[in-house]
């Protein structure tokens, strides 16, 4: 089943997705869509990057990390209950059937009523301990035979829980990563 991430109404939700470019600036097109990943591309695209830049985005959806280094994690600003559902991150690696797709489930909870104001947390409160993706077997090393200069060396697991927004930067070392090159 999809990996589940949580946020409260009014927060910014964070959906992690990473790859490692073969070389600086050697980017791979990525799309984010609302709904499970279809056979090609992303359905209901909310954001897209190409080999150079973010070339399409919609209101409230943005990349907070450094996408030029492969951090294509999606931030959804000021979420509402309607933002609940499955999101697709697709890393469109060139070649024969090389693209990778990840389905992430976002669960939005009503905002907690607290007696005193508290610091708003920007990112989802808890992450599952293991990242699994529909359509993929166990994490393993794969070689992209059609592109001799590109290797898909690792799809790693998300092993940490995000307990506070200050840990967001650590996700690059613990998130779902596709390493190319």
């Amino acid at each position: 089943s999809e990996v589940e991430y949580r946020a409260e109404v009014g927060q910014n939700a964070y959906l992690p997705c990473f790859y490692t470019p073969a070389a600086p600036g050697n980017l791979v097109p990525v799309c984010w869509g609302k709904g499970a990943c279809p056979v090609f591309e992303c359905g209901n695209v909310v954001l897209r990057t190409d080999e150079r830049d973010v070339n399409y985005w919609t209101s409230r959806y943005w990349l907070n990390g450094d996408f030029r280094k492969g951090d294509v994690s999606l931030t959804i600003e000021n979420v509402t209950l309607a933002d609940s559902g499955i999101y697709c991150c697709r890393i469109q690696i060139p070649g024969i059937m090389n693209d990778e797709k990840f389905n992430l489930k976002l669960v939005i909870k009503p905002a907690k009523v607290t007696p005193a104001p508290t610091r708003q947390r920007d990112f989802t409160a808890a992450f599952p301990r293991m990242l699994t993706t529909r359509g993929h077997g166990p994490a393993e090393t794969q070689t992209l035979g059609s592109l001799p200069d590109i290797n898909l060396t690792q799809i790693s697991t998300l092993a940490n829980e995000l307990r506070d927004s200050r840990l967001a930067n650590d996700l690059r070392d613990s998130g779902a990563t596709i390493r190319i090159g």
Epitope: G35, A36, V39, F40, G43, Q92, P94, G95, I96
Partner: antibody, heavy 120, light 107 residues
Framework: QVQLVESGGGLVKPGGSLRLSCAAS????????MSWIRQAPGKGLEWVSS????????YYADSVKGRFTISRDNAKNSLYLQLNSLRDDDTAVYYC?????????????WGQGTTVTVSS | DIVMTQSPSSLSASVGDRVTITCRAS??????LNWYQQKPGRAPKLLIY???SLQSGVPSRFSGSGSGTDFTLTISSLQPEDFATYYC?????????FGGGTKVEIK
């Protein structure tokens, strides 16, 4: 008028080769994924191969992988399928089709088909 | 591979009848299910996309429903031009797969 027209079919001996073409008109060809679908005589539809709008990403059915090659020339609004090492069970009508929205919403434009007959 | 199982494989009906064709996927395909109509010697024609959305130009007597693994194509009042073979197709993952087809014949 949105249109796809296939050509290149014919009679070929087992082990032989053919190159199918699909000429597109009436739409911005480079915006769409494209696919080849085939239908053996009296049988159902079978997906063969697909290619992304830029041509950088390619997909094949296991039954044709290593024998067939899909390609496209966006400057010429053309889709191609190179058929090598043909077998009797490759005999079929071959259709090219446009994948609307990357196929998550189906193949909305089809050509009339070109017939490939593999026989000794 | 995702196996698409269509039923019935054929049916006989009269003009004006309500016809229902079912399609079952071997795994969850969300709403990535399309329906096509094919007449002898012709290319398939897209009728329904994304399980329930009517393709432009298709008569409203055609409708689709379902999500996950079970899907239905309904023709509310069969017309003479509707006698054809109908195929479902999943576009959730490669290989793209079609159902075996349902031939709708005149009773």
């Amino acid at each position: 008028q949105v249109q796809l027209v296939e050509s290149g079919g014919g009679l070929v001996k087992p082990g032989g080769s053919l190159r199918l073409s699909c000429a597109a008109s009436g739409f911005t060809f480079s915006d769409y994924y494209m696919s080849w679908i085939r239908q053996a005589p009296g049988k159902g539809l079978e997906w063969v191969s697909s290619i992304s709008n830029s041509g950088s990403t390619i997909y094949y059915a296991d039954s044709v992988k290593g024998r067939f090659t899909i390609s496209r020339d966006n400057a010429k609004n053309s889709l191609y399928l190179q058929l090598n090492s043909l077998r009797d069970d490759d005999t079929a009508v071959y259709y090219c089709a446009r994948n609307w929205q990357g196929a998550d919403y189906g193949m909305d434009v089809w050509g009339q088909g070109t017939t490939v007959t593999v026989s000794s | 591979d995702i196996v698409m199982t269509q039923s019935p494989s054929s049916l006989s009906a009269s003009v004006g009848d309500r016809v229902t064709i079912t399609c079952r996927a071997s795994q969850n395909i969300s709403s990535y299910l399309n329906w096509y109509q094919q007449k002898p010697g012709r290319a398939p024609k897209l009728l329904i996309y994304a399980a329930s959305s009517l393709q432009s130009g298709v008569p409203s007597r055609f409708s689709g429903s379902g999500s996950g693994t079970d899907f239905t194509l309904t023709i509310s009042s069969l017309q003479p031009e509707d006698f054809a073979t109908y195929y479902c197709q999943q576009s959730y993952s490669t290989p793209l797969t079609f159902g075996g087809g349902t031939k709708v014949e005149i009773k």
